[in-house]
Interface confidence: low
């Protein structure tokens, strides 16, 4: 950055190089150039000359004042107008940053995704700090009292092999940057209670021609967990409200769930599971689309391309339509 330049003087910032966003700041420039009593001192921000709020303090020093500085980052440098050098001479430069101290991390959550081999811990970091903010995740065994610390910029994956202190732990997160430090509440976990089963996936759908047409959704998971509770939610794509069905599931075979749906309507389905009685759910699966046939059942092709229709001779309408969802906000 600009801090690597060779200086012929000194540039400094008050109150500090990293400061709270919205503060009034002063940038000082002091020339120390051989054979130069500067005629003028100039300040540049991101390469653009500043024209206002510059005060000459003495023969070699000037101050640039900013009110309510709101830029997260800026490169500042100053120059001297040295007549005998025939040109502007660089004095020095500095990268400055403004932002906020970290909020207290909350909603600390640790889960073990089945087969991942990791415990994944996340938290709500709060408002954007704009400046480099580091997080230290503390993991303390309640059985051995041994504590491990993990430095990260966001979430953390901790190998379950490194969790040698039994099954019970305290987890908390410390957030720190140049403007402050905060610590979350402690989360108590039991490793057996935080496992999330392997993802459940909807594979296909078909509508069976019967007195009342019936739609069957086929779905599965690779989980080895015996007792699993699942939810499937569905709605017409034109609706805002989801309908939810609950299942106690054994994934030794592909699951088939039956729904009685309106004809000639496009529906969307998602599924999620948890180990029965435990705290955390999977994120919802990717969106699965299925359009029910008109009264004579029809076959649907992959969703979100145009819907193609075959002749009315088929006995079932089959969908294999997926669209990846963003899966936000689904743990817990």
């Amino acid at each position: 950055g600009i801090t690597n330049i060779n200086c012929s003087g000194h540039i400094w910032v008050e109150p500090a190089t990293i400061f709270k966003m919205g503060m009034n700041i002063s940038i000082y420039c002091q020339a120390a150039i051989k054979n130069c009593q500067p005629r003028k001192l100039h300040f540049y921000k991101n390469g653009i000359k500043e024209r206002f709020q510059i005060t000459r303090i003495n023969k070699t020093t000037a101050r640039l004042w900013y009110k309510n500085f709101l830029e997260p980052h800026a490169s500042m440098y100053c120059t001297a107008e040295c007549p005998k050098h025939f040109q502007e001479t660089l004095i020095c430069g500095k990268d400055i940053s403004s932002g906020y101290p970290p909020d207290i991390p909350d909603e600390v959550t640790c889960v073990i995704y089945e087969y991942s081999g990791n415990m994944t811990c996340t938290w709500n970091a709060g408002k954007l700090t704009y400046i480099d903010t580091k997080y230290v995740v503390h993991v303390k065994s309640l059985e051995t009292e041994e504590e491990q610390q993990y430095l990260t910029s966001s979430y953390i994956n901790i190998s379950t092999d490194s969790l040698q202190g039994g099954k019970k732990y305290l987890v908390w997160v410390q957030a720190a940057n140049a403007l402050g430090m905060e610590e979350s509440k402690q989360l108590q976990i039991h490793l057996d209670d935080i496992v999330i089963p392997s993802a459940a996936v909807i594979s296909r759908a078909e509508t069976i021609n019967a007195t009342v047409p019936k739609t069957i959704i086929y779905w599965d998971s690779q989980t080895t967990i015996e007792k699993v509770s699942c939810e499937m939610r569905y709605k017409a794509t034109t609706n805002q409200t989801w309908n939810v069905k609950e299942f106690d599931t054994n994934f030794t075979y592909v699951q088939q769930s039956e729904f009685y749906l309106e004809p000639n309507i496009k529906y969307v389905f998602q599924v999620r599971c948890q180990e029965t009685g435990k705290r955390y759910w999977q994120p919802w699966s990717s969106l699965f689309f299925h359009k029910t046939p008109e009264t004579v059942p029809q076959v649907t092709s992959k969703a979100f391309q145009h819907d193609t229709w075959n002749s009315g001779l088929t006995v079932a309408s089959i969908s294999t339509g997926h669209l990846t969802s963003d899966n936000r906000g689904d743990i817990g």
Partner: antibody, heavy 128, light 107 residues
Framework: QVTLKESGPGILQPSQTLSLTCTFS??????????VGWIRQPSGKGLEWLAN???????YYNPSLKNRLTISKDTSNNQAFLKITNVDTADTATYYC????????????????????WGQGASVTVSS | DIVMTQSPTSMSISLGDRVTMNCKAS??????VDWYQQKTGQSPKLLIY???NRYTGVPDRFTGSGSGTDFTFTISNMQAEDLSVYYC?????????FGSGTKLEIK
């Protein structure tokens, strides 16, 4: 109106000291940022910068001649001087003095210093 | 020292021609190049300063451009009174140095 005029001996012999005077008007060498320079030009050849003197008596010399050159000024009489010791036939040339001044480049750009006014030149011949 | 290599050394031109000459610095001089005109028997006169700025009273047929190491001086419509030698000079660092000059002659 800015004018500069050089004066010198015209002819001198090798090993002697050349003394040149620049008398100027229309500006003052006591003004911050003002300078006077000396430049020479052998007949039919190019220009060679010799030395500058600034308002604060700071001096700059061409390294190739530095140990033979002395620049000075008399601010009150609006004069600048150049001495060249131990002259040789290679010092035969027309010697110019010139003003160096700042030219404003706009509110967001620093002034630019340029050799903007020259004297008519003083012809100097070194001959035995 | 910074060497200013000026080209061509001389040019034979006709009145009304567009005339272009170049100056190449041996190292980066930013925009700190000036152009001077010297008529026979006279002292040099400043035409262009800081690469592209016309000095007071200089006709707009004279233009300059360039930065870094490569600079160009152009006369867009050659007049009889423009027959001269033209010099570039760098004022980026001491010692100040001049190009060797470009002499304009009539064909």
């Amino acid at each position: 109106q800015v004018t500069l005029k050089e004066s010198g001996p015209g002819i001198l012999q090798p090993s002697q000291t050349l003394s040149l005077t620049c008398t100027f008007s229309g500006f003052s060498l006591s003004t911050y940022g003002m300078g006077v320079g000396w430049i020479r030009q052998p007949s039919g050849k190019g220009l060679e910068w010799l030395a500058n003197i600034w308002w604060d008596d700071d001096k700059y010399y061409n390294p190739s001649l530095k140990n033979r050159l002395t620049i000075s000024k008399d601010t009150s009489n609006n004069q600048a001087f150049l001495k060249i010791t131990n002259v040789d036939t290679a010092d035969t040339a027309t010697y110019y003095c010139a003003r160096i001044d700042a030219h404003p480049m706009g509110i967001t750009t620093p002034d630019y210093y340029v050799v903007d006014a020259w004297g008519q030149g003083a012809s100097v011949t070194v001959s035995s | 020292d910074i060497v200013m290599t000026q080209s061509p050394t001389s040019m034979s031109i006709s009145l009304g021609d567009r005339v272009t000459m170049n100056c190449k610095a041996s190292q980066n001089v930013g925009s700190n190049v000036d152009w001077y005109q010297q008529k026979t028997g006279q002292s040099p006169k400043l035409l262009i300063y800081k690469a592209s700025n016309r000095y007071t009273g200089v006709p707009d047929r004279f233009t300059g451009s360039g930065s870094g190491t490569d600079f160009t001086f152009t006369i867009s419509n050659m007049q009889a009174e423009d027959l001269s030698v033209y010099y570039c000079m760098q004022s980026n660092s001491y010692p100040l140095t001049f190009g060797s000059g470009t002499k304009l002659e009539i064909k």
